[in-house]
């Protein structure tokens, strides 16, 4: 169940998709990834206030228990709900190869 | 890819399964759940230091970018990798029913 998309903390403060530009050096990939030379990394960043984009029943429980025991139980966390595939051209022992990664770029976010 | 399970922060400090005892009142379920009267909620709690239980490539990227831009990119977060089903006896309009929830109790944790 995908709960409320209204952010009570103000526009853009809650869990949503962000794009971060990163070089191969930034990612520690300079040795094995040849292309792209720069990656537009889409990731999930932002707060998860009560019931905002709750991914499932577990997220709802976590919200309730965090309210009761904030020092013990953390608030739900903003993580990818799905991913976009990305093709990397990577170095192999003898040359280069194209490899598709299905779990690299976040496509959609939720709180869990 | 499931990365290192050694916690550099000390025993029990990194992302792992915890059990939190919760009453129906704690969970806000007193009105619609009849049984169990108390739930041993298993949830994922703990820090996600570099490459600890990295769920996938996205988590590895997040670790690298968090190291570079800690104010912009958060560290990976400890969330369920899988769930255990749980049966709740719940109140309906006309009586009670048994309902299995597949996304309520964390079974295993990883960092993402």
């Amino acid at each position: 169940a995908r709960n409320g998309d209204h952010c009570p903390l103000g526009p853009g403060r809650c869990c949503r998709l962000h794009t971060v530009r990163a070089s191969l050096e930034d990612l520690g990939w300079a040795d094995w990834v040849l292309s792209p030379r720069e990656v537009q990394v889409t990731m999930c960043i932002g707060a998860c206030p009560s019931q905002f984009r709750a991914a499932n029943m577990h997220a709802q429980i976590k919200t309730s228990l965090h309210r009761l025991k904030p020092d013990t139980v953390p608030a739900p966390c903003c993580v990818p709900a799905s991913y976009n595939p990305m093709v990397l051209i990577q170095k192999t022992d003898t040359g280069v190869s194209l490899q598709t990664y299905d779990d690299l770029l976040a496509k959609d976010c939720h709180c869990i | 890819a499931r990365n290192g399970d050694h916690c550099p922060l000390g025993p029990g400090r990194c992302c792992r399964l915890h059990t939190v005892r919760a009453s129906l009142e704690d969970l806000g379920w007193a009105d619609w759940v009849l049984s169990p009267r108390e739930v041993q909620v298993t949830m994922c709690i703990g820090a996600c230091p570099s490459q600890f239980r990295a769920a996938n490539m996205h988590a590895q990227i997040k670790t690298s970018l968090h190291r570079l831009k800690p104010d912009t990119v958060p560290a990976p977060c400890c969330v369920p990798a899988s769930y255990n089903p749980m049966v709740l006896i719940q109140k309906t309009d006309t009586g009670v029913s048994l309902q299995t929830y597949d996304d309520l109790l964390a079974k295993d944790c990883h960092c993402i």
Epitope: E25, A30, D31, L34, S35, I89, K91, T94, G95, V96 | -
Partner: antibody, heavy 113, light 111 residues
């Protein structure tokens, strides 16, 4: 930003020779580096290249005749057992996939008995 | 081994005119565009002109233009200057490291 090869010299056939490439203005640990050679009056031959961390790769004709290695400050090319056919100007250059964008002036190695 | 065939030398050009050099490969380069063009003058190291088949390297005049993909590539020099007299090389990166290399070179003579 620049690269420079060590002085070339006259060597006798079979005597191993190591050329050293030094970079200025950029970090070798962030870049792929290549070695290319050119025999007098001939075209360019790509010998091989080395990754940012120092792993070397070679083109087919090399066949064990050369070894490329890398330290934090230099890239070395060892001619394991030179023959007269290895007489050439040897160039160190920065790059691999997106072209070789910075070249050294080159150094002449003469193999003669 | 890969055969990278360039336009035979020498190629004659006139100042202000246009010259075209071709580079044909017996196998496709990586991504269809991992091909570079270099200019070399006597006694000097090569200079990168074009990379990724069509991207102009830093500081290179826009008179130089690269085109093509896969196995067939072209370098076009428009508004030719005396300073363009040089030997031009194409170089390709292939799926197998052992195939990487340069074309034989094309000498451009400017009259």
């Amino acid at each position: 930003q620049s690269v420079k090869e060590s002085e070339g010299r006259l060597v006798t056939p079979g005597t191993p020779l190591t050329l050293t490439c030094t970079a200025s203005g950029f970090s070798l640990s962030s870049h792929w580096m290549s070695w290319v050679r050119q025999a007098p009056g001939k075209g360019l031959e790509w010998i091989g290249f080395v990754s940012p961390s120092g792993r070397a790769y070679y083109t087919s004709w090399v066949n064990g005749r050369f070894t490329i290695s890398k330290t934090s400050t230099t890239v070395d090319l060892k001619i394991t057992s030179p023959t007269t056919e290895d007489t050439a100007t040897y160039f160190c250059a920065r790059g691999y996939t997106s072209g070789l964008d910075i070249w050294g002036p080159g150094t002449l190695v003469t193999v003669s008995s | 081994a890969i055969d990278m065939t360039q336009t035979p030398s020498p190629v004659s050009a006139t100042v202000g005119g246009t010259v075209t050099i071709s580079c044909q490969s017996s196998k496709s380069v990586v991504n269809g565009d991992w091909l570079a063009w270099y200019q070399q003058k006597p006694g000097q190291p090569p200079k990168l002109l074009i990379y990724d088949a069509a991207t102009l390297a830093s500081g290179v005049p826009s008179r130089f233009k690269g085109s093509g993909s896969g196995t067939q590539f072209t370098l076009t020099i428009s508004d030719v200057q005396c300073a363009d007299a040089a030997t031009y090389y194409c170089a390709g990166v292939y799926n197998n490291d052992s195939d990487n290399g340069f074309g034989g070179g094309t000498e451009v003579v400017v009259k």
